[in-house]
Amino acid sequence: MMTGTIETTGNISAEKGGSIILQCHLSSTTAQVTQVNWEQQDQLLAICNADLGWHISPSFKDRVAPGPGLGLTLQSLTVNDTGEYFCIYHTYPDGTYTGRIFLEVLESSVAEHGARFQIP
């Protein structure tokens, strides 16, 4: 039975040209995290594997940095980066947990963080 929950940074906004940290945290389970995949609308951004470490997709190498922790840092943001991001936690023996973050990249300097929320 899957008992864990994923807490994410929720709905966030950031300024064009700036950077943002995407963070997820798995709690309420003793399952072993074997891998975390970061995805954006059916595109692989990065993978962090417990044994192999980080792999950043070649097309994002210049703008994506691993960490902090299992999170992901997006740099040199553009308006095209607006959209849904997913952290997919592969765990043993529970299986897969998915967290969702919505990022809005703003032209103006007004960028606020949204509330944190949980996905079971």
Partner: antibody, heavy 118, light 107 residues
Amino acid sequence: EVQLLESGGGLVQPGGSLRLSCAASGFTFSSYSMSWVRQAPGKGLEWVSSISSNTGTSYYADSVKGRFTISRDNSKNTLYLQMNSLRAEDTAVYYCAREPYDVWMDYWGQGTLVTVSS
Amino acid sequence: DIQMTQSPSSLSASVGDRVTITCRASQSISYYLNWYQQKPGKAPKLLIYAASSLQSGVPSRFSGSGSGTDFTLTISSLQPEDFATYYCQQSYSTPLTFGGGTKVEIK
């Protein structure tokens, strides 16, 4: 340099058994999931089995489930495929492949031919 | 099981041609799609992983695109060493499945 070297293939009668080995070198074997893929003469590629790095969990194609067993010995950097109750349709070249991040197969061995015939 | 359908099954082309091979999954597989090249008597070689990422050491004339159910492998300018059979493969779920292959022959 990453190398995968299969061995153990040969001619076997229907109902017989074989154990294939895949000796790995040039990388930290224990950190990678590994797979077996086969190719019947003149045919396409067919996945046979995989074993994960972190948990040792194994997965099988329906066509071999209950007859084949995948295993690994990380101390020997070797992947195995125990094949029992072999059938004529198991005749193929068997490849081992490294599977980083459980998403793609980036290195393959040269293959070993298994022929099941009476 | 997820079925992978490749088309065409074979094609004839000339050196310098632009070649496109398509692969369709029977259900959405997100970006979990890889492309391999195989020459007679040789092991498959990874070209493209995760739908669009070029494997290290593979020439840039190879590119991949698509997500969900429809994917494409493109060779921008066919070279003599590119005549081979190409396979797509999904890694979204087990059983892992391959397309039937596309044989690229010399016209």
